[in-house]
């Protein structure tokens, strides 16, 4: 399926799982992009923000003395509450341990900026992508993924951290956004809605998709997540929209079939390694890119977001399993775990393809509203 008003030949899908290529062009700041900390009640019941370590849980942050230079690829780091000892953290949701910064939730108190001041920053994520306003940037080359086809053993940790379902990735998954822009994958997690209600974090021309996958990466310039937080390009997230299609997605089924085992908040299981790239669209050449933030506290900025133009297709049953199996804090279903879109505040979203123009043969050099900043500069 295509996004609203998307050019006909820009399938936001057609990827590894028969997706449609729905993203067109990028997103300029707009009035309706006025800053919001969380989803105003009423905007599709949008929850607040995402669960990265702040993007879900980033890999554990280890004290420097322990495993210096090595990274535990588990939960993304959560923000340390003022005065908290710098202890290694296993996951972002630590209510029972009294870490103030784990006391956040979607669509409610406390306001996220109180949890982490960065959540009130000017360059936050997610955003609404407007293909017509995206800057076509030919310098954005196809993404390169290496080592994403994991063998079944060793097994991987799949965890319900109360904010999302997160798969911790082993060392060795390398991703390049371009020459000299190299990253290592840490974890992936999903965002979803509820019955009949979409739950992607990013939107395209205001259209929200059923769900969204995020694969979180750490720049090879940093040994630890806590060193990279807030640094431009320190973290990079690959994001893809999940849509309903006619067939079961066998790659996703390897994870979705295990959700019942981790229905309870804080529970985890082990799953066989799988081809992580099969969870993403097949077209690595067409995407949108912008600099934003983690979508959950600590909301650290400087995160490079790459949003695939192609979507991934899951069956209706699979999307239902995703949105209706897990439980979060306070005996409530884990649903609508997405943050409201944030204002661009002057940011220009770049596109690796001419997303805002009919790309049929008759179109010569498309005229773009925004010009591209050379990637990697």
């Amino acid at each position: 399926q295509r996004l609203p008003r998307m050019q006909e030949d820009s399938p936001l899908g057609g990827g590894s799982s028969g997706e449609d290529d729905p993203l067109g062009e990028e997103d300029l700041p707009s009035e309706e992009d006025s800053p919001r900390e969380e989803d105003p009640p009423g905007e599709e019941d949008l929850p607040g923000e995402e669960d990265l370590p702040g993007e879900e849980d980033l890999p554990e942050v280890k004290p420097k003395s322990e495993e210096e230079g090595s990274l535990k690829l588990e939960d993304l780091p959560t923000v340390e509450a003022p005065g908290d000892p710098q202890e290694p953290q296993n996951n972002a949701h630590r209510d029972k341990e009294g870490d103030d910064q784990s006391h956040w939730r979607y669509g409610g108190d406390p306001p996220w900026p109180r949890v982490s001041p960065a959540c009130a920053g000017r360059f936050q994520s997610p955003v609404d992508i407007r293909p017509q306003l995206a800057a076509f940037c030919p310098a954005l080359r196809p993404l390169e993924l290496l080592g994403f086809q994991l063998p079944p053993l060793p097994e991987l940790r799949l965890r319900n951290n109360g904010h999302s379902v997160q798969l911790t990735l082993p060392p060795g998954l390398e991703m390049a956004l371009g020459p000299g822009r190299e990253y290592r994958a840490l974890q992936l997690h999903l965002h979803w809605g509820a019955a009949g209600r979409p739950g992607s974090e990013h939107t395209v021309e205001g259209h929200r998709f059923p769900a969204e996958i995020h694969v979180v990466h750490l720049s090879t310039a940093f040994a630890r997540v806590d060193e990279a937080l807030g640094r431009p390009g320190g973290l990079a997230v690959l994001a893809a929209f999940l849509e309903e299609g006619p067939e079961e997605n066998s790659a996703y089924e390897q994870l979705l079939s295990r959700l019942e085992e981790i229905a309870e908040e804080g529970s985890e299981t082990q799953v066989p390694g799988l081809d992580i790239s099969a969870l993403l669209p097949s077209d690595f050449s067409r995407y949108f890119q912008y600099e934003g933030s983690l979508t959950t506290p600590p909301c650290a900025q400087g995160v490079i977001w790459t949003v695939f133009n192609q979507t991934v297709m899951l069956s209706a049953k699979q999307l239902h399993t995703l949105s209706d199996t897990l439980w979060g804090p306070g005996d409530s279903r884990l649903q609508l775990n997405f943050r409201a879109t944030q204002p661009l505040n002057g940011r220009v979203i770049e596109a690796s393809f001419p997303a805002g123009v009919d790309s049929s043969p008759r179109a010569a050099e498309p005229v773009q509203l925004n010009s591209c900043l050379a990637a990697g500069d």
Epitope: P152, L153, Q254, T269, Q270, P272
Partner: antibody
């Protein structure tokens, strides 16, 4: 040499319980996941389940056909793996094999060492 | 669950023949497939792992090939001791599943 020796089979009535044992020798038992595979008379092989090693938390995994009725456990100090079968049904009648498969150095589950098998007959 | 379909279900062959047994898998399992040999009254024995790797002690006349959803076990020159039932097994994800077996008989 590397071997798995099984015991505990026999005739049992439907609804009753039985425990199979599998004693390992000749290899570092703690490194491995231990599986159970069964074969109904004249039929093919069916995976029953496995138990992970200590490094992976000793957690078990079961096939849908036995989940909730069978329990796999292990005693590393005795190098024994167990299959506790409760609420047995006539369709559980089979030769049960204890199998070694999967450890820190392997990259998927293949079954390289098999016990001699023990027949479990569920009949009234 | 991943379905495994072997073909043929049975075949007759003579000593010295070249024999191939196929295993079709319902979804992509990369190379995470093993082959086993079982003789009557005995436990199965591992022949091939990771689609094409020969297990220790297995004669070199046995070989395996394939990846994704199609796999083949080949016996280059059939010997009398090779008459048995052969099973393929996927080790990509649980529940681990086996093919229904191929019975190799003397012609």
């Amino acid at each position: 040499q590397v071997q798995l020796v099984q015991s505990g089979g026999g005739l049992v009535q439907p609804g009753r319980s039985l425990r199979l044992s599998c004693t390992a020798s000749g290899f570092t038992f703690t490194d491995y996941y231990m599986h159970w595979v069964r074969q109904a008379p004249g039929k093919g092989l069916e995976w029953v389940g496995f138990i992970r090693n200590k490094a992976s938390g000793y957690t078990p995994q079961y096939s849908a056909s036995v989940k909730g009725r069978f329990t796999i456990s292990r005693d590393d100090s005795k190098t024994i793996a167990y299959l506790q079968m409760n609420s047995l049904k006539t369709e559980d009648t089979a030769v049960y094999y204890c199998v070694r498969g999967g450890h820190a150095g392997s990259n998927y589950w293949y079954f390289d060492v098999w016990g001699q098998g023990t027949l479990v007959t569920v009949s009234s | 669950d991943i379905q495994m379909t072997q073909s043929p279900s049975s075949l007759s062959a003579s000593v010295g023949d070249r024999v191939t047994i196929n295993c079709h898998v319902s979804q992509n399992i990369n190379v995470w497939l093993s082959w086993y040999q079982q003789k009557p009254g005995e436990a199965p024995k591992l022949l091939i792992y990771q689609a094409s790797n020969l297990h220790t002690g297995v004669p070199s006349r046995f070989s395996g090939s394939g990846s994704g959803t199609g796999f083949t076990l080949t016996i280059r020159s059939l010997q009398p001791e090779d008459y048995a039932t052969y099973y393929c097994q996927q080790g990509q994800s649980y529940p681990f599943t086996f093919g229904q077996g191929t019975k190799l008989e003397i012609k």
